[in-house]
């Protein structure tokens, strides 16, 4: 490491043409691990790069990179997951540009799945439920979700809740009625691991019932 | 070789602040965090707070909290603490030391003697 | 906060003999294989130097007579043989959770 400058104004000036970012994956398949890198720059040449990393490894020194289309990825169990990793990207043997990475702070979880939302007239309320293969994991166990909705004519009216569970019950009161909804959920790292949201569910619909005024009810 | 170098010993009456510095070199600066630990004499070993010198973004000891800032120069690749309202109680060596995974130190400035008497 | 007890306080051991220290955390301290426990050993006058990290990965430069394991809420670390120059405080530290707290030391003494 003795060649990078020490001065704060150049060290950050090395190389941005290559400059990269990385998110890591945690028992993604099996107990094997994921990490996955691409170019900032969608432009950038990439024939000849290559990427490598070096360090926090089990039983071996380094390891490299497989190329898929524009984006780098290695699965192995060999990430220690304790101590900083040195990602490069390299051409011919020679390293163009390096950055320290801890794979426990690039966490991207992965996506949320079966959403549904099931109206229950007698409380006048939806219950919002969804899955996380988290929930099998050993590692990335403790996730906080990120639920969205809107109206469906609302474009970017997007609301938001945070909850730690699997269920969220919305209200109907809170909604407005014989109105289309959008619904999906992400997830981030949320103990000890740190890192990205994940890639949104696939969203559901849902349509709000009209307003069934009983006699003698008032609007709400 | 990778290097921790902190500024000198310290008297300070109760109720002032002191500042002390760590100078990095041997490495590039904005690759590790680097921490504050505190001994007092004859004790064990404490965490005070760290700082990431990429960011500038810090986490405290919620018991030196108010009381503690740390900052850091990249220009210079140091980094400062800065304890103020100082008692007897905070008498003690102070650390500074990077943190080669999170978070555990794996280089350690030599120390420096503060000490606080009226 | 985490409360890491060591144990013993101290002990005196003699040369080529081992030497057992333990760390008890109020909490566990893992996940899944990921042991969040360090060792440092501090001789008079001088800063701490890592021995151990993820409770039993050896430092770069660390000799190999030293040693960790445990997992969860017990950990150890172990000088197998013991030499004179390991005459030291040992603290083990653990890094889970904020704030990262230490041990109270063990004084290990060379008879």
């Known amino acids: 490491e003795s060649g990078y400058a020490q001065n704060g104004d150049l060290e950050d000036a090395e190389l941005d043409d290559y400059s990269f970012s990385c998110y890591s994956q945690l028992e993604v398949n099996g107990s094997q691990h994921s990490l996955t890198c691409a170019f900032e720059d969608p432009d950038v040449n990439t024939t000849n790069l290559e990427f490598e990393i070096c360090g926090a490894l089990v039983e071996v020194k380094c390891l490299s990179f497989r190329k898929l289309q524009e984006i780098y990825f290695i699965e192995t169990k060999k990430f220690l997951l304790i101590g900083k990793s040195n990602i490069c990207v390299k051409v011919g043997g020679k390293s163009l540009t390096c950055k320290k990475i801890d794979l426990t702070t690039i966490v991207k979880p992965e996506a949320p799945f079966d959403l549904s939302v099931i109206y229950r007239e007698g409380a006048n309320d939806f219950v919002v439920t969804f899955n996380t293969s988290h929930l099998q994991k050993k590692y990335v166990k403790v996730l906080m979700h990120d639920v969205a909705y809107r109206q469906e004519k609302d474009e970017n009216k997007w609301m938001h809740v945070n909850l730690s569970s699997t269920k969220l019950t919305l209200l109907q009161r809170n909604l407005q009625p014989e109105a289309m909804y959008e619904i999906k959920v992400r997830s981030i790292p949320d103990h000890y691991f740190k890192g990205f949201w994940s890639e949104w569910s696939p969203s559901y619909y849902f349509r709000t019932p009209e307003i069934n005024n009983s006699p003698g009810e008032m609007d709400p | 070789q990778v290097q921790l170098v902190q500024s000198g010993a310290e008297v300070k009456k109760p109720g002032a602040s002191v500042k002390v510095s760590c100078k990095a070199s041997?490495?590039?600066?904005?690759?590790?965090?680097l921490h504050w630990v505190k001994q007092a004499p004859g004790q064990g070993l404490e965490w005070i707070g760290g700082?990431?010198?990429?960011?500038?973004?810090?986490a405290y000891n919620q018991k030196f909290k108010g009381r503690v800032t740390m900052t850091s120069d990249r220009s210079t690749s140091t980094v400062y603490m800065e304890l103020s309202s100082l008692r007897s109680e905070d008498t003690a060596v102070y650390y500074c030391a990077r943190s080669g995974g999170r978070w555990y130190f794996d280089v350690w400035g030599q120390g420096t003697t503060v000490t606080v008497s009226s | 906060d985490i409360v890491l007890t060591q144990s013993p306080a101290s002990l005196a051991v003699s040369p080529g003999q081992r030497a057992t220290i333990t760390c008890r955390t109020s909490e566990s301290v893992s996940i899944h294989l990921l042991h969040l426990m360090h060792w440092y050993q501090q001789k008079p006058g001088q800063p701490p130097k890592l021995l151990i990290y993820?409770?039993?990965n050896l430092e770069s430069g660390v000799p190999a007579r030293f040693s960790g394991s445990g997992s969860e809420t017990d950990f150890t670390l172990t000088i197998n043989p013991v030499e004179a120059e390991d005459t030291a405080n040992y603290y083990c530290q653990q890094s889970i959770k904020d704030p990262y707290t230490f041990g109270g030391g063990t004084k290990v003494e060379i008879k």
């Open positions: 993820g409770a039993s």
């Open positions: 041997g490495y590039r600066f904005t690759d590790y965090e």
């Open positions: 700082i990431d010198p990429k960011t500038g973004g810090t």
